[in-house]
Interface confidence: medium
C-alpha cells in the first residue's frame, strides 16, 4: 500500500505517532468486568498522544495497524489464590464499541501466574474504543509498574 | 507535540532510530541484585544503536517514548523451584541514574513459572541508566534465546 | 549506520513498513513440531503487508532489524496439565533457513501456565524463513485472540 | 539420538599446535552451549572451555587461557578446539560435551563424546 | 591441591546402600552450588546422574539419589548393583562461569 504524495510531503507527525501508556485507575462496579485506566503526565510516566480517554476506556483517533500491549498483575496474589480452586480469572482486550466493530483481540488467564502480560499487532479504526475485561473474583494491582495498557501506531 | 522544522528536514534517522538488544553477560557480586548486559554483532545476535553499556548497564543517549521489553528465563527451574518454598523471585526495571530520576517501570514475580516476558512504553531522557534487578536465590539462565532485554526509541 | 541519500529522499514506505500478524493455521504432522500460519483480511484481523508465507512459515522479504512477538495459548489445558508429570511443553521461534542461518531466537516453557508471551527485537534478512516449534504432546488454541504470530520492521 | 564425535587427537611436541573437531547430530546444535572438558590419564575432570549457542561468548579455564580457541560452526554443527603452545599438562582425553541449559551459569553436561586423545611429548 | 574433595574409593556389597559425600576444601557446600554427579565405567564417557543437588537426570535409576548432608552434597546409591561399580565425580558452581570437579571416588561392588 503506497503512501500518497500528500502523505509523503507531511511532516511525519501526519503519518501518525498515536501513543498512549495507561496506569489503572479503578475497577468496575460488580457487574463491570471493564478496567478503567486514566493517563497523564501529571499521574507520573502515563501519557495519550492521539488517542483519548472515554470513561476510563481508551478510544482510537487514527486509521492504522496498532500494537496492542498489557501487563496486568493480581494484588494480594499467591500461585494458590490463581490455581484451580478459583474460578479462573481471565483478561481480554477488546474493541467494545462501535457494536458493529465488537471482537475480543487478546485474552490470557492467569493459572497459577498473577502476571500476565502480552502484545499484539492489530488494525484499528477511528472511533473504535478499547475495553479490557477482568473476570473472576481478584483484584488487579494499582501500582504503576505492574499494571499499564498501551496502543502504539505502527503503520497505515 | 509538534516537530520543529528543522526536525521535518533532517534526515529520518536524526529523529531517533535509536535500538539495542542485549544478552545477559553475568549477575552481579553478592550483594548485588542488577543483572549485567552485553551487546554487538561478534557476540551474537545482540546490538547498540544509538544507546550504550556502561559496566553492564544500559544508557539512554536520546530522550524520547521507548518501548522497553525483556525476557528473563531461571536457569535449572521447575515450577516447584519458583513456587512459594523459596524467597519470591522478582525481576524489576527501572531507572536507577540518575538519582533524581529513579523509578520503577516494570516489575514481575516468577510465581510458580520459570519465565517471564513483558514490556512497556515509557519516556526515557538522555542519561537515563536503566538497570534490571533480579532479587532472590535462583540465577538466570544465559542462553541468548531466553534471556534478553531491548529497547527501542518510537518517538519523540 | 546512516541512511543513504537515495534512502532519505525516498517516501517513507521504501525505508520499510514490512508488518504481519498472523493466526494459526494448523500443526504439523506427528514428526513435524512446527506450527503452521495463516493471514489475510478474509480470515478476520490478521494480515501480511511485506513479508510471505511459504507452506504456513512467515519468509522475511526485507533487511532490518524486526520486533517479533508471539502468544501462543494450549487448547483444553490446567496447571497440572503442563506441570512436572508431563514431558515440558516449549515454544521456539527461530530461523529454519536458510540452513546457514538455522538459529533459535526465542524460547519459552509452559511450566504450569497455559500461555506464553513474548516479543525481541532481532536483526533479520531477506529469505529468512522463522519456524515456530511447540514441542510437548499438548496442543495449541486455534482461537484468535489467544494464538497469534507477528513481526514488524523497525530499523535498517 | 544426540551424537557427539571428536576428531583431531594425536600426539604433538611441546609447543606444537592441534585443531580438534566436535561432530554433533541428533539435536538442535545451535540451541545449546558447548564445552570441552579433558581428564588426564588416571585422573580426575577438568572444565576447559564452553561457548554461546551463537559461537560469540567464550569462556576459559585459567590453565587454558590464551592458548586454546573455542569455536563453532552451527551451519555445521561442529564444535571446535584450536589448541596452540601446547605443554606436558595439557595431556588428556579431550571431550565435547553438550550443555543441558538448564543453566549457562552452571555448566551441566548431559550428552558427552567418546573423547580424543591428545598426547603432548617429545 | 584440589578445591572440590571426594572419598578416593568406597565399598558396598549388592543390594547395599552407599554414600558417597563431595565437599569443599574451606567452606560448606549448599544448593547454591548447585552439586552434580557424573557416573563414568572405564573406557567410557561420562554419564549426567543428578543436577542440582537432587535432580535426577532423564532415564536415571530412582536408586540413585542426591541431598546436601551437613556441610556436604552426598550421591546416595540403594540397593546397589553390579553395574554400578565405576567412578563418580561430583561438580560444584563456585565462580562464574566453571565449575570444579572433585577428584572423583571409585566405587566397587563387592561380590
Known amino acids: 500500500q503506497r503512501l500518497s504524495r500528500a502523505q509523503q510531503q507531511l511532516p511525519l507527525e501526519s503519518l501518525g505517532w498515536d501513543i498512549a501508556e495507561l496506569q489503572l485507575n479503578h475497577t468496575g462496579p460488580q457487574q463491570d468486568p471493564r478496567l478503567y485506566w486514566q493517563g497523564g503526565p501529571a499521574l507520573g510516566r502515563s501519557f495519550l498522544r492521539g488517542p483519548e480517554l472515554d470513561k476510563g476506556q481508551l478510544r482510537i483517533r487514527r486509521d492504522g495497524i496498532y500494537m496492542v500491549h498489557i501487563q496486568v498483575t493480581l494484588a494480594i496474589c499467591s500461585s494458590t489464590s490463581t490455581s484451580r480452586h478459583h474460578h479462573p480469572t481471565t483478561l481480554a482486550v477488546g474493541i467494545c464499541s462501535p457494536a458493529s466493530r465488537s471482537i475480543s483481540l487478546l485474552r490470557l488467564s492467569f493459572h497459577q501466574g498473577c502476571t500476565i502480560a502480552s502484545q499484539r499487532l492489530t488494525p484499528l479504526a477511528r472511533g473504535d474504543t478499547l475495553c479490557t475485561n477482568l473476570t473472576g473474583t481478584l483484584l488487579p494491582s494499582r501500582n504503576t509498574d505492574e499494571t499499564f495498557f498501551g496502543v502504539q501506531w505502527v503503520r497505515p | 507535540q509538534r516537530l520543529s522544522r528543522a526536525q521535518q528536514q533532517l534526515p529520518l534517522e536524526s529523529l531517533g532510530w535509536d535500538i539495542a538488544e542485549l544478552q545477559l553477560n553475568h549477575t552481579g557480586p553478592q550483594q548485588d541484585p542488577r543483572l549485567y548486559w552485553q551487546g554487538g554483532p561478534a557476540l551474537g545476535r545482540s546490538f547498540l544503536r544509538g544507546p550504550e553499556l556502561d559496566k553492564g548497564q544500559l544508557r539512554i543517549r536520546r530522550d524520547g517514548i521507548y518501548m522497553v521489553h525483556i525476557q528473563v528465563t531461571l536457569a535449572i527451574c521447575s515450577s516447584t523451584s519458583t513456587s512459594r518454598h523459596h524467597h519470591p523471585t522478582t525481576l524489576a526495571v527501572g531507572i536507577c541514574s540518575p538519582a533524581s530520576r529513579s523509578i520503577s517501570l516494570l516489575r514481575l514475580s516468577f510465581h510458580q513459572g520459570c519465565t517471564i516476558a513483558s514490556q512497556r512504553l515509557t519516556p526515557l531522557a538522555r542519561g537515563d541508566t536503566l538497570c534490571t534487578n533480579l532479587t532472590g536465590t535462583l540465577l538466570p539462565s544465559r542462553n541468548t534465546d531466553e534471556t534478553f532485554f531491548g529497547v527501542q526509541w518510537v518517538r519523540p | 549506520q546512516r541512511l543513504s541519500r537515495a534512502q532519505q529522499q525516498l517516501p517513507l514506505e521504501s525505508l520499510g513498513w514490512d508488518i504481519a500478524e498472523l493466526q494459526l493455521n494448523h500443526t504439523g504432522p506427528q514428526q513435524d513440531p512446527r506450527l503452521y500460519w495463516q493471514g489475510g483480511p478474509a480470515l478476520g484481523r490478521s494480515f501480511l503487508r511485506g513479508p510471505e508465507l511459504d507452506k504456513g512459515q512467515l519468509r522475511i522479504r526485507r533487511d532490518g532489524i524486526y520486533m517479533v512477538h508471539i502468544q501462543v495459548t494450549l487448547a483444553i489445558c490446567s496447571s497440572t496439565s503442563t506441570s512436572r508429570h508431563h514431558h515440558p511443553t516449549t515454544l521456539a521461534v527461530g530461523i529454519c533457513s536458510p540452513a546457514s542461518r538455522s538459529i533459535s531466537l526465542l524460547r519459552l516453557s509452559f511450566h504450569q501456565g497455559c500461555t506464553i508471551a513474548s516479543q525481541r527485537l532481532t536483526p533479520l534478512a531477506r529469505g529468512d524463513t522463522l519456524c515456530t516449534n511447540l514441542t510437548g504432546t499438548l496442543l495449541p488454541s486455534r482461537n484468535t485472540d489467544e494464538t497469534f504470530f507477528g513481526v514488524q520492521w523497525v530499523r535498517p | 539420538e544426540v551424537q557427539l564425535v571428536e576428531s583431531g587427537g594425536g600426539l604433538v611436541q611441546p609447543g606444537g599446535s592441534l585443531r580438534l573437531s566436535c561432530a554433533a547430530s541428533?539435536?538442535?546444535?545451535?540451541?545449546?552451549?558447548m564445552n570441552w572438558v579433558r581428564q588426564a590419564p588416571g585422573k580426575g575432570l577438568e572444565w576447559v572451555s564452553d561457548i554461546n549457542n551463537e559461537g560469540g561468548t567464550t569462556y576459559y579455564a585459567d590453565s587454558v587461557k590464551g592458548r586454546f580457541t573455542i569455536s563453532r560452526d552451527n551451519s555445521k554443527n561442529s564444535l571446535y578446539l584450536q589448541m596452540n603452545s601446547l605443554r606436558a599438562e595439557d595431556t588428556a582425553v579431550y571431550y565435547c560435551?553438550?550443555?543441558?541449559?538448564?543453566?549457562?551459569?552452571?555448566?551441566?553436561?548431559?550428552?558427552w563424546g567418546q573423547g580424543t586423545l591428545v598426547t603432548v611429548s617429545s | 591441591q584440589a578445591v572440590v574433595t571426594q572419598e578416593p574409593s568406597l565399598t558396598v556389597s549388592p543390594g547395599g546402600t552407599v554414600t558417597l559425600t563431595c565437599g569443599l576444601k574451606?567452606?560448606?557446600?549448599?544448593?547454591?552450588?548447585?552439586p552434580t554427579w557424573y557416573q563414568q565405567t572405564p573406557g567410557q564417557a561420562p554419564r549426567l546422574l543428578i543436577y542440582n543437588t537432587n535432580t535426577r537426570h532423564s532415564g536415571v535409576p530412582d536408586r540413585f539419589s542426591g541431598s546436601i548432608l551437613g556441610n556436604k552434597a552426598a550421591l546416595t546409591i540403594t540397593g546397589a548393583q553390579a553395574d554400578d561399580e565405576a567412578e563418580y565425580f561430583c561438580?560444584?558452581?563456585?565462580?562464574?562461569?566453571?565449575?570444579?570437579f572433585g577428584g572423583g571416588t571409585q566405587l566397587t561392588v563387592l561380590g
Open positions: 574451606s567452606g560448606s557446600v549448599t544448593s547454591d552450588n548447585f
Open positions: 561438580a560444584l558452581f563456585i565462580s562464574n562461569p566453571s565449575v570444579e
Open positions: 541428533g539435536f538442535t546444535f545451535s540451541v545449546y552451549y
Open positions: 560435551a553438550r550443555d543441558a541449559g538448564y543453566s549457562n551459569h552452571v555448566p551441566i553436561f548431559d550428552s
